[in-house]
Interface confidence: medium
Amino acid sequence: QPDAINAPVTCCYNFTNRKISVQRLASYRRITSSKCPKEAVIFKTIVAKEICADPKQKWVQDSMDHLDKQIQTPKP
């Protein structure tokens, strides 16, 4: 199960089957390498755990948008 992997993930072979609440998410990166079997998003949680997610799912897109907005508008 990829969401139990703590070493840096370079490719995703499986996606998490549950939505992760945005409060848990610290950052994300996209995996688009042709060496990987599928396009993916890797979320880093607030306890530095990496989780593979399907970029086609709406909650994944919404979470990426949320994180992008945070970076653009830091808290005073």
Partner: antibody, heavy 122, light 112 residues
Framework: EVQLQQSGAELVRSGASVKLSCTAS????????MHWVKQRPEQGLEWIGW????????EYAPKFQGKATMTADTSSNTAYLQLSSLTSEDTAVYYC???????????????WGQGTTVTVSS | DIQMTQTPLTLSVTIGQPASISCKSS???????????LNWSLQRPGQSPKRLIY???KLDSGVPDRFTGSGSGTDFTLKISRVEAEDLGVYYC?????????FGGGTKLEIK
Amino acid sequence: EVQLQQSGAELVRSGASVKLSCTASGFNIKDNYMHWVKQRPEQGLEWIGWIDPENGDTEYAPKFQGKATMTADTSSNTAYLQLSSLTSEDTAVYYCNTWAYYGTSYGGFAYWGQGTTVTVSS
Amino acid sequence: DIQMTQTPLTLSVTIGQPASISCKSSQSLLDSDGKTYLNWSLQRPGQSPKRLIYLVSKLDSGVPDRFTGSGSGTDFTLKISRVEAEDLGVYYCWQGTHFPQTFGGGTKLEIK
């Protein structure tokens, strides 16, 4: 105001078990990870592990596998740490803590309980 | 596990003077997401630890700007520009990049 209120000091016999509690107010524990940290007398801090109260997922530092069991009850907004087969090495202060937005540019916060002293007597 | 080594063990500083604490990790704390999960906490006498700094240099809410964190890779520093009486206690660096999360041994700041 966010607070983590921990249960009172425990004096327990060697070989017994003890269950500590950490009750949160001002936030919902199921929106955060809850961590436990050990501090032996006059020593540094050791991370025990975390629990995701929403689904019960846990991750333990290898040293505490089999020694510590973390659980949570979202209805009472409380996290628990059970320590088993106690020895003098387990005499310590145990802290619960939580943080959110750790690792984002948005900001961060971290809260700690006041600690629970566990004394193991032979 | 990642080893976190802090120096000095004890620091004796006059109020109003600067202070500096070093923290070295046994492996780079630069994560694959480009972030460095290095934090500093202060434990005042008889109190719980309190996080001061996360992500190397970001100050937690309410932490005075006399505290600054810096560094990269394996070498990190916490600086206090002018020590005040409330700053005494034990300072810990800790990392969240690698599992399991690990703490430094602590640096005790004493007031001269």
